[in-house]
């Protein structure tokens, strides 16, 4: 786990987030289905697994979520290119750490993230990027806890 | 509108350090990664790595690790590259460029510092 | 490193010709990918990123395509402003690494 660390600055992430998450929750047509929330998946995933399972998420927010998502309002569409953008370059240095061969995906891994995965697909596809990015907390929330995330001065 | 202006040449001996400044304006300083890109005189361009000047975190380019050190002052919105153990061949002009935010995200480097040259010679 | 290998190194061209810029990476780089343009004493200008998106401001005679490991860039008829240098970029792993450049020159 220490020779994967997320080297960008969550704190910013976070408040990037804080900034759009009621107008994007306000956004969601479907309160009561989850895609990540209620991931019990998430909160035992293995020390082992983190590195995959981060990588695997990043890729479903950079390659699914972020390019399904279709935002008028100019300025919450800056905040979530910005999280986007810092997404981007975590996902480029766990593809570092990847190539270190430091960051294994076990069958436990893949299968947490087929379950995200899974979840999204049963959604419209707009209602699932919406969905998605109000529980972005909650895969902010694991980063935080499961990773050292080096907050440079 | 967006800028990025660098410090003036600069002449150096073989051994030194070379510290090159990049003044951003125009634009929310914290909001967009900066890199650093070198070009040798009549040859290509080289990624040298990346500064994110809101958390400071950095990458650099394998080659560098070890010589070269970003940094950052955010107060005037000023991103520096400093290139110690200076050696002939790194004898080139020095560019910073923004990085773009864009949606879905991607990289591409969309506003560039007009270059510092930077001469090592004995 | 990932190596791009660009080719033809150089072309001379005339006005209101198709130029095909091609570029190799050493291996798949899925389209973490851009192109630039160089014009001597200047720098470099962004035109196409993510394999084929136009860069803002970039004359849609401009068009990027590839995926993987081949890419291409392609303008559609020359102008005269468009002799230049052109390097294409990868960005999927550390260190990023630009080609080695084409030179377009008038025919």
């Known amino acids: 786990l220490r020779r994967c660390l997320i080297s960008t600055d969550m704190h910013h992430i976070e408040e990037s987030f804080q900034e759009i998450k009621r107008a994007i929750q306000a956004k969601d047509t479907f309160p009561n289905v989850t895609i990540l929330s209620t991931l019990e998946t998430l909160q035992i995933i293995k020390p082992l697994d983190v590195c995959c399972v981060t990588k695997n998420l990043l890729a479903f927010y950079v390659d699914r979520v972020f390019k399904d998502h279709q935002e008028p309002n100019p300025k919450i569409l800056r905040k979530i290119s910005s999280i986007a953008n810092s997404f981007l370059y975590m996902q480029k240095t766990l593809r570092q750490c990847q190539e270190q061969r430091q960051c294994h995906c076990r069958q436990e891994a893949t299968n947490a993230t087929r379950v995200i995965h899974d979840n999204y697909d049963q959604l419209e596809v707009h209602a699932a990027a919406i969905k998605s990015l109000g529980e972005l907390d909650v895969f902010l929330a694991w980063i935080n806890k499961n990773h050292e995330v080096m907050f440079s001065a | 509108q967006v800028q990025l202006v660098q410090s003036g040449a600069e002449v150096k001996k073989p051994g030194a350090s070379v510290k090159v400044s990049c003044k951003a304006s125009?634009?929310?300083?914290?909001?967009?990664?900066l890199h650093w890109v070198r070009q040798a005189p009549g040859q290509g361009l080289e990624w040298m790595g990346w500064?994110?000047?809101?958390?400071?975190?950095?990458n650099y380019a394998q080659k560098f690790q070890g010589r070269v050190t970003m940094t950052r002052d955010t107060s005037i919105s000023t991103a520096y590259m400093e290139l110690s153990r200076l050696r002939s061949d790194d004898t080139a002009v020095y560019y910073c460029?923004?990085?773009?935010?864009?949606?879905?995200?991607?990289?591409?480097?969309?506003?560039w510092g007009q270059g510092t040259l930077v001469t090592v010679s004995s | 490193a990932i190596q791009l290998t660009q080719s033809p190194s150089s072309l001379s061209a005339s006005v209101g010709d198709r130029v095909t810029i091609t570029c190799r990476a050493s291996?798949?780089?899925?389209?973490?990918f851009g192109w630039y343009q160089q014009k001597p004493g200047k720098a470099p200008k962004l035109l196409i990123y993510?394999?084929?998106s136009l860069q803002s401001g970039v004359p849609s005679r401009f068009s990027g395509s590839g995926s993987g490991t081949d890419f291409t860039l392609t303008i559609s008829s020359l102008q005269p402003e468009d002799f230049a240098t052109y390097y294409c970029?990868?960005?999927?792993?550390?260190?990023?690494?630009f080609g080695q450049g084409t030179k377009v020159e008038i025919k």
């Open positions: 460029a923004r990085d773009i935010v864009v949606l879905p995200p991607a990289i591409g480097f969309d506003y």
């Open positions: 125009g634009y929310t300083f914290t909001g967009y990664y």
């Open positions: 500064i994110n000047p809101n958390s400071g975190g950095t």
């Open positions: 291996q798949d780089i899925r389209s973490d």
């Open positions: 993510a394999a084929s």
């Open positions: 970029l990868q960005d999927y792993n550390y260190p990023w690494t």
